[in-house]
Amino acid sequence: AGTPEVWVQVQMEATELSSFTVHCGFLGPGSISLVTVSWGGPDGAGGTKLAVLHPELGTRQWAPARQARWETQSSISLALEDSGASSPFANTTFCCKFASFPEGSWESCGSLPPSSDPGLSAPPTPVPILRADLAGILGLSGVLLFGCGYLLHLLRRQKHRPTPRLQPSHTNSQALTAQAWAPSQASQAALHDPYATINTSFCPATLDTAHPNGWASLPTHAAHQPQGPAASASTPILARGSFVSVENGLYTQAGERPPHTGPGLTLFPDCRGPRALEGRFGVR
């Protein structure tokens, strides 16, 4: 089984410039327990929550989110309404975090290109960032040193070979689209920025968070590329300055125990198996 991936696609309808839709999907074998969509940065790192979606409880959303919904069992969409005369969404980063079992939490971000001209020239490659939760870094300087060394090695190696192509995607030709992909390995995309960090936050799949049926079955389309609502093959317009962060660790507070799937759940638990999470959200 390959490393899970999260894709993010931001669309602005050509007919309605104040209407945006964020599409996100999870490609992996795990069971999705929660999806958080934020803007202005990753959730918990300067970003502001726009919506939280649970596969059975439903969805919570906050302005300017208009409608959050599941498109498939492993992808969601969030419609946004821009009431302002100017369009603040155009320069905004949107992030989607998928909490899955047993992989942990994976997040990816993307944004619209600054120009609204559909005929943009070839864009730069998104920058992959391995993001670390601060609490997980403490006391793990050794891991960080190793990571920095590895990243430097990658940087050096990338200079001596061409930038690989992004994975092909399907986008709506009627929309301006930005897509950010979380590659299976960091080396699959060019590392242009020196400030990447290594994620050290991990929530192990302990016995009390184990899936009742063992490993979850593969999502029906996990092996395929994501497909937009009205998809037609075209070259995606990638956001300038968009980035991807791959985070393999469920987001728990330091010192918080992984809750059990039975009674006595910890409030607002972020690190838990699907049964414990499968039962609370409703689309609002």
């Epitope: 502001t48 929550k49 939280v52 649970h54 596969p55 059975e56 409880l57 439903g58 919570r60 959303q61 906050w62 302005a63 919904r69 599941w70 498109e71 498939t72 069992q73 992808s75 507070q253 918080e256 759940l265 910890t266 409030l267 607002f268 638990p269 972020d270 499968e278 039962g279 609370r280 959200f281 409703g282 689309v283 609002r284």
Partner: antibody
Framework: EVQLVQSGAEVKKPGSSVKVSCKAS????????IEWVRQAPGQGLEWIGE????????NYNEKFKGRVTFTADESTSTAYMELSSLRSEDTAVYYC???????WGQGTLVTVSS | DIVMTQSPDSLAVSLGERATINCKSS????????????LAWYQQKPGQPPKLLIY???TRESGVPDRFSGSGSGTDFTLTISSLQAEDVAVYYC?????????FGQGTKLEIK
């Protein structure tokens, strides 16, 4: 174990305001919405609205818009609901709840009487 | 707003017998994307807050006895208590968890015959 503890019962005059508090413990306060639901004597449950403590983003039931205000204090993990221009039909038990109505406070009885 | 209508308003069942409560929504609570129904059931005993029993129309909350089960799809849902116990005497509510605002049924009072 998550707990939501609400402030005590209140008796108010028509036209006045009431502010009910809801203190959360046992989890990450800013992760999920705090919901407010009320129940008039012998009646059903009515959603008033919600607040997301981290960003103070809110959603209100149209019926209560303009009369209700939600606030949250992350430093004390406490959410507040203030209802103004009280009338007799606002007499009810007011509940705070979280995580998609999985956790509930014990309720606060607000009596509006002249 | 989605209107939730429960039937019957009250129900008297003998101990050990089956109790069935119905809930009808004015709009479908089925999300076509992931084929999930966003409906929840709550139990409320006198002087207590409601307690979540069932979510996703049929998934039992942790710690809820298996005599409680939920079924249905779209607009028609059912809560079944397979063998009524004395402690099950309460008011039961269904709730639209599909779209804003969350709305509740008027409640069904369950008593022992």
């Amino acid at each position: 174990e998550v707990q939501l503890v609400q402030s005590g019962a209140e008796v108010k005059k028509p036209g006045s305001s009431v502010k009910v508090s809801c203190k959360a413990s046992g989890g990450t306060f800013s992760s999920f919405s705090i919901e407010w639901v009320r129940q008039a004597p012998g009646q059903g449950l009515e959603w008033i609205g919600e607040i997301l403590p981290g960003s103070n983003s809110t959603n209100y039931n149209e019926k209560f818009k303009g009369r209700v205000t939600f606030t949250a204090d992350e430093s004390t993990s406490t959410a507040y609901m203030e209802l103004s221009s009280l009338r007799s039909e606002d007499t009810a038990v007011y509940y705070c709840s979280s995580y998609w109505f999985a956790y509930w406070g014990q309720g606060t009885l607000v009596t509006v009487s002249s | 707003d989605i209107v939730m209508t429960q039937s019957p308003d009250s129900l008297a069942v003998s101990l050990g017998e089956r109790a069935t409560i119905n809930c009808k929504s004015s709009q479908s609570l089925l999300n076509s994307g992931n084929q999930k129904n966003y409906l929840a059931w709550y139990q409320q005993k006198p002087g207590q807050p409601p307690k979540l029993l069932i979510y996703g129309a049929s998934t039992r909350e942790s710690g809820v006895p298996d005599r409680f089960s939920g079924s249905g799809s779209g607009t028609d849902f059912t809560l079944t208590i397979s063998s009524l116990q004395a402690e099950d005497v309460a008011v039961y509510y269904c709730q639209n968890a599909h779209s804003y605002p969350p709305t509740f049924g008027q409640g069904t009072k369950l008593e022992i015959k």
